[in-house]
């Protein structure tokens, strides 16, 4: 995890209502400019359809907890999870699913079919992402789920599967 | 729609070369931080290759009109739609492709073969998602349109076809 | 390029430590609201498995060097690139590849299989997406890597294969 | 310290299949891919291949339409296999480490751990 | 893919410094910072000394140093001494995936 001071951290901006007078640099640390962001890599062991995410990833203004992305900001946030499959054909089509879940709730799911002409080949490599542009409230959880995390290339590609968000406006 | 006061938006930032004077709030809100996004899900009736959208997503900022979302700040625009489709294979492949207008001008079009096996199947779900980076000026409009929008999977999956913008910098 | 003067350019912002006192557009101005994006096109015409780009695309406190887009201001960028494939399918299946690259290192890639059915067909269309979102460094190289480049679409489609940075939050 | 160990039969008769096995000892065979290497007597070294847990396989194009390999996690090792094999694919075949995945990057270190390599034949 | 070009043989005097090039293309040596050299003694198997172009291995002797310019990769040896007479191999990943080997140079140590 990246422990950089970046400027407009959400750690160092004094709260409002602070007595703040004529301090410029006061003032404008208090405007509106605060910034949250995460970027982690899946776990490498996956068990069960929640994904679990790799905590030692890009983790600012935002906590990471038994597979949630916790939201400690306020305000819109941009959402975006990619994810890297890789399919042993059985004899019949595959429909792989990624949803995204606010709360434990499904705000979005992308689906996508391989392996449809039923033959058995030795592998189809198959990507796929979702994104999502929605208000966030302090708390709030934003976790991933795959129906078919088998599938999911976690021992020669980790780095390709990504769970993202970064708040585009706050709402203080 | 989201009606939060937001800070920055573009509803209340005084227009320039009013009286400021030493109002530091004043100043701070003439700053060029204005925020404009919307993000709206598909209509659930399809009738035609031009898609149109429930106006009751979010929308700040940005008008929508007959399928269009109307630009009403300047500035570089970070735009994305993303569509679910299912199809019922015929006996021949299908190309499914989605196009995002500016002013009724295609900038950017993403194309996806599938049923590329030739064989009838139950169905195949196929997610395509395509993003433009442009300078907007006020009433531009951004529209989205699909060849195949009878493939469109309207019903069991309304949330997932999606059209967004947002601006990333203005250009006052 | 786009030359449009626009606020909080990289190239006008004074130097921090410069004298401001009192001057509130010159603080403002020092502040740390810099922008830097690029949204390039690829070239007509490829020649290997590095992607070159148009260099007359949006380029904005980012410079185009050699199929490199060069940063030059330090921060956390989002990057996505997107590729439009068009494959004459030969009798068997093929996995397109992109990766994305940073100083010369692999940092993400996508895969996906195409022509799984491993018939003949006239063309099978596939679109392909990678993001990244990471901290660079001024100096630091962005570059795209395509395996099967004859693929690339660069006559019917020039405009879909694009590559785009933008600095979500600098690093001063 | 990981310690790798081929073994296969070392006379191979020419158009039949050759048959190698890497055991991998003092680490998981999980964590990594793993690469085929040959090098004829005399000769240059020439990568065949390499292989990893997820059924991800990458091959030298001028092989590829001959060569199968596979992971077996439970006992810790990995195979190849070549067929249809002439005389031209007399040579000592060593199995190695390759690529790592560690903290936010790929580690593209080459092959780092290498077996000691046994000798095949192609000889009817 | 083509093998990657070295030359068969260089020699050196202990002591002195030689230098072994290896020249790859624009989808290799060119395109990632992936280039590895390993030495080998006769009969034994290879051992890598520099990985991603110049990071050496712990326990690989600082005498060794790897560099690249464009699509040729250098290895330097410093202070050459008796037994770093070995052959010396080079190898790019490639765009496909795929690793490279050079055809090898044979280090005599006069």
């Known amino acids: 995890q990246r422990t950089d001071s970046i400027p407009n951290s959400p750690d160092n901006i004094p709260l409002r209502g602070g007595n703040c007078s004529e301090d410029l640099l006061c003032i404008l640390k208090r405007a509106p400019f605060k910034k949250s962001w995460a970027y982690l890599q899946v776990a490498k062991h996956l068990n069960k359809t929640k994904l679990s995410w790799n905590k030692d990833g890009i983790l600012h203004g935002v906590r990471y907890q038994d597979g949630n992305l916790v939201i400690q900001f306020p305000g819109l946030y941009f959402i975006i999870c990619q994810l890297q499959f890789l399919v042993q054909c059985p004899n019949n089509s595959v429909d792989l699913k990624l949803e995204l879940l606010i709360n434990k709730h499904i705000k979005k799911q992308a689906l996508v079919t391989v392996c449809e002409s039923g033959m058995q080949t030795k592998h189809v490599y198959q990507n796929l992402s979702q994104f999502l542009l929605d208000y966030l409230q302090v708390n709030t959880t934003v976790s991933v789920n795959v129906d078919t995390f088998q599938y999911i290339d976690t021992s020669t590609f980790p780095l390709e599967n990504v769970l993202s968000v970064f708040l585009y406006s706050n709402s203080d | 729609q989201r009606t939060d006061s937001i800070p920055n938006s573009p509803d209340n930032i005084p227009l320039r070369g009013g009286n400021c004077s030493e109002d530091l709030l004043c100043i701070l809100k003439r700053a060029p931080f204005k925020k404009s996004w919307a993000y709206l899900q598909v209509a659930k009736h399809l009738n035609k290759t031009k898609l149109s959208w429930n106006k009751d997503g979010i929308l700040h900022g940005v008008r929508y009109q007959d399928g269009n979302l109307v630009i009403q700040f300047p500035g570089l625009y970070f735009i994305i739609c993303q569509l679910q489709f299912l199809v019922q294979c015929p006996n021949n492949s299908v190309d499914l492709k989605l196009e995002l207008l500016i002013n009724k001008h295609i900038k950017k079009q993403a194309l996806v073969t599938v049923c590329e096996s030739g064989m009838q199947t139950k169905h195949v779900y196929q997610n395509l998602s395509q993003f433009l980076l442009d300078y907007l000026q006020v009433n531009t409009t951004v529209s989205v349109n699909v060849d195949t929008f009878q493939y469109i999977d309207t019903s069991t999956f309304p949330l997932e076809n999606v059209l967004s913008v947002f601006l990333y910098s203005n250009s006052d | 390029q786009r030359t449009d003067s626009i606020p909080n350019s990289p190239d006008n912002i004074p130097l921090r430590g410069g004298n401001c006192s009192e001057d509130l557009l010159c603080i403002l101005k020092r502040a740390p609201f810099k922008k830097s994006w690029a949204y390039l096109q690829v070239a007509k015409h490829l020649n290997k498995t590095k992607l070159s780009w148009n260099k007359d695309g949006i380029l904005h406190g980012v410079r185009y060097q050699d199929g490199n887009l060069v940063i030059q201001f330090p921060g956390l960028y989002f990057i996505i690139c997107q590729l439009q494939f068009l494959v004459q399918c030969p009798n068997n299946s093929v996995d397109l590849k992109l990766e994305l690259l940073i100083n010369k290192h692999i940092k993400k890639q996508a895969l996906v299989t195409v022509c799984e059915s491993g018939m003949q067909t006239k063309h099978v269309y596939q679109n392909l997406s990678q993001f990244l979102l990471d901290y660079l460094q001024v100096n630091t190289t962005v570059s795209v890597n395509v395996d099967t480049f004859q693929y690339i679409d660069t006559s019917t489609f020039p405009l879909e294969n694009v590559l785009s940075v933008f600095l979500y939050s600098n690093s001063d | 310290q990981v310690q790798l160990q081929e073994s296969g039969p070392g006379l191979v008769k020419p158009s039949e299949t050759l048959s190698l096995t890497c055991t991998v000892s003092?680490?998981?065979?999980?964590?990594?891919?793993w690469s085929w290497i040959r090098q004829p007597a005399g000769k240059g070294l020439e990568w065949i291949g390499r292989?990893?847990?997820?059924?991800?396989?990458n091959y030298n194009p001028s092989l590829k339409s001959r060569v199968t390999m596979s992971v077996d996690t439970s006992k810790n090792q990995f195979s190849l296999k070549l067929n249809s094999v002439t005389a031209a694919d007399t040579a000592v075949y060593y199995c190695?480490?390759?690529?790592?995945?560690?903290?936010?990057?790929?580690?593209?270190?080459?092959?780092?751990?290498w077996g000691q390599g046994t000798t095949v034949t192609v000889s009817s | 893919q083509s093998a990657l070009t070295q030359p068969a043989s260089v020699s050196g005097s202990p002591g002195q410094s030689i230098t072994i090039s290896c020249t790859g293309t624009?989808?290799?040596?060119?395109?990632?910072?992936?280039v590895s050299w390993y030495q080998q003694h006769p009969g034994k198997a290879p051992k890598l000394i520099i990985y991603?172009?110049?990071n050496r291995p712990s326990g690989v002797s600082n005498r060794f140093s790897g560099s690249e310019s464009g699509n040729t990769a250098s290895l330097t040896i410093s202070g050459l001494q008796a037994e770093d007479e070995a052959n010396y191999y080079c190898?790019?990943?490639?765009?496909?995936?795929?690793?490279?080997f050079g055809g090898g140079t044979k280090l005599t140590v006069l």
């Open positions: 190695a480490r390759d690529f790592t995945i560690a903290a936010r990057r790929y580690y593209y270190y080459g092959m780092d751990v």
């Open positions: 003092g680490g998981s065979i999980s964590s990594y891919s």
């Open positions: 292989t990893s847990t997820s059924g991800r396989n």
């Open positions: 624009s989808s290799d040596i060119g395109l990632y910072n992936y």
């Open positions: 991603e172009v110049i």
């Open positions: 190898s790019s990943y490639t765009s496909s995936s795929t690793w490279v």
